[in-house]
């Protein structure tokens, strides 16, 4: 039950996170005009990854797309790439995790397959979240660098007679959305990886069998598997509750392939 809850919660958190990454990527307010210590202008500038906008006090807003690809700063291109990679990985992760959900039955999919898919989606979410956090952080670093450069050169004048105000930009709402969304996707991915450990069959029904060189005897574990005889693995046996009791005869137990995940 806890595994299903962890997996479900991980999925929901990742879903919210990826929705946030998509929202942040599409938002226009990655950088906004710094209004602190600035002459009071009736025009407010803000920029996104895809276009820059100007909102006038009249209420009129004008946005212009970046129609050039080669003319854009390499850093902006890198941020775009990171965010898109994050979205793509996240979307694939979501698709995989839907089929991996314990509460959803698809044919006769085994728990081991679901565990693998959960782990895969978890890793994808982690990488997706890291991509988003990296993208937003690179952009934020770019803003900080430009901010201090323009602060040092706040007014460029012609002989001190005519002053030109240089617009400074600070962190926009999209950066905070991106950081939070990336963090949520990362947390969701970690939760999926944790859920994967619980999903994997920790031990197989071989554990219920004790092996003797001499004979073909059967050992019963109290409350464990219904005993299966000999070396034959009976995959249809269901584990009800493993009381953890071990008989003196129980010499060897074969680990599941998922014990080391």
């Amino acid at each position: 039950m806890a595994v299903t809850a962890c997996q479900g919660l991980g999925f929901v958190v990742s879903l919210i996170g990826i929705a946030g990454i998509i929202a942040a990527t599409c938002m226009d307010q990655w950088s906004t005009q710094d209004l602190y210590n600035n002459p009071v202008t009736a025009v407010f500038n803000y920029q996104g990854l895809w276009r820059s906008c100007v909102r006038e006090s009249s209420g009129f807003t004008e946005c212009r797309g970046y129609f050039t690809l080669l003319g854009l700063p390499a850093m902006l291109q890198a941020v775009r790439a990171l965010m898109i990679v994050g979205i793509v990985l996240g979307a694939i992760g979501l698709l995989v995790s839907i089929f991996a959900l314990k509460c959803i039955r698809i044919g006769s999919m085994e728990d081991s397959a679901k565990a693998n898919m959960t782990l895969t989606s978890g890793i994808m979410f982690i990488v997706s979240g890291l991509c988003a956090i990296a993208g937003v952080s690179v952009f934020a670093n770019m803003l900080v660098t430009n901010f201090w450069m323009s602060t040092a050169n706040m007014y460029t004048g012609m002989g001190g007679m005519v002053q030109t105000v240089q617009t400074r930009y600070t962190f926009g709402a999209a950066l905070f959305v991106g950081w939070v969304a990336g963090g949520l996707t990362l947390i969701g991915g970690v939760m999926m990886c944790i859920a994967c450990r619980g999903l994997a069959p920790e031990e197989t029904n071989y554990k219920a069998v004790s092996y003797h060189a001499s004979g073909h005897s059967v050992a019963y574990k109290p409350g464990g598997f219904k005993a299966s005889t000999g070396f034959g693995s009976n995959t249809k046996n269901k584990k009800i509750y493993d009381g953890g009791a071990r008989t003196e005869d129980e010499v060897q137990s074969y680990p599941s392939k998922h014990d080391y995940v």
């Epitope: 009071v40 202008t41 009736a42 500038n45 006090s57």
Partner: antibody, heavy 118, light 113 residues
Framework: QIQLVQSGPELKKPGETVKISCKAS????????MNWVKQAPGKGLKWMGW????????TYADDFKGRFAFSSETSARTAYLQINNLKNEGMATYFC???????????WGQGTLVTVSS | DIVMTQYPSFLTVTTGEKVTMSCKSS????????????LTWYQQKPGQPPKLLIY???TRESGVPDRFAGSGSGTDFTLTISSVQAEDLAIYYC?????????FGSGTKLEVK
């Protein structure tokens, strides 16, 4: 079509209060700011400030802080300019003007002449 | 406050003549975000409210005859009337629409002979 109709001329004594109205029609009132411009007889235009008709927030030019107040009534689609404690230099024509692209003022009221005389 | 200086104060021209008037601002009115200059030109005829001619320094308002043209960038702006008509007799004002307060220039009075 878009129209701004202002209240009629006012004759006031120094120290009195005057309230000028500007009724808008032909557009969504709260979508655009309303500016107020003063023109003293034979003088140039002086921008007094503007009111954000959506939020009710006002911005005043330094010379018009204190005795001047902008307000608006959305239901009546009307903006108001109130001048308290009128002085002789308050005698002027007051225009309301709606803002648009480039913060320009394409639509103007006909003006309200305020005469201050003792 | 931004100071808007208009010159000349008076202009006397004959019908059909080309006329140019200037407006200079104490600070640049160019917004880097959209590369637009926030300067507006108005025409005011006696006894009438001002009429918008040009916004964003060079964009003609709809319904304004194409003989009116605005130009300039940063701090120096010009309004040109390519062929003055008798009805152009008016005072022309420039206005800063970038910095608060939105100051007007003192105006250029155009008289037609």
């Amino acid at each position: 079509q878009i129209q701004l109709v202002q209240s009629g001329p006012e004759l006031k004594k120094p120290g009195e209060t005057v309230k000028i109205s500007c009724k808008a029609s032909g557009y969504t009132f709260t979508n655009y700011g309303m500016n107020w411009v003063k023109q003293a007889p034979g003088k140039g235009l002086k921008w007094m400030g503007w009111i954000n008709t959506y939020t009710g927030e006002s911005t005043y030019a330094d010379d018009f802080k204190g005795r001047f107040a902008f307000s608006s009534e959305t239901s009546a689609r009307t903006a108001y300019l109130q001048i308290n404690n009128l002085k002789n230099e308050g005698m002027a024509t007051y225009f309301c003007a709606r803002s648009y692209n480039g913060n320009s003022l394409p639509y103007w009221g006909q003006g309200t002449l305020v005469t201050v005389s003792s | 406050d931004i100071v808007m200086t208009q010159y000349p104060s008076f202009l006397t021209v004959t019908t059909g003549e080309k006329v140019t008037m200037s407006c200079k601002s104490s600070q640049s009115l160019l917004n880097s975000g959209n590369q637009r200059n926030y300067l507006t030109w108005y025409q005011q005829k006696p006894g009438q409210p001002p009429k918008l001619l040009i916004y964003w320094a060079s964009t003609r308002e709809s319904g304004v005859p194409d003989r009116f043209a605005g130009s300039g960038s940063g701090t120096d702006f010009t309004l040109t009337i390519s062929s003055v008509q008798a009805e152009d007799l008016a005072i022309y004002y420039c206005q800063n629409n970038y910095f608060y307060p939105f100051t007007f220039g003192s105006g250029t009075k155009l008289e037609v002979k």
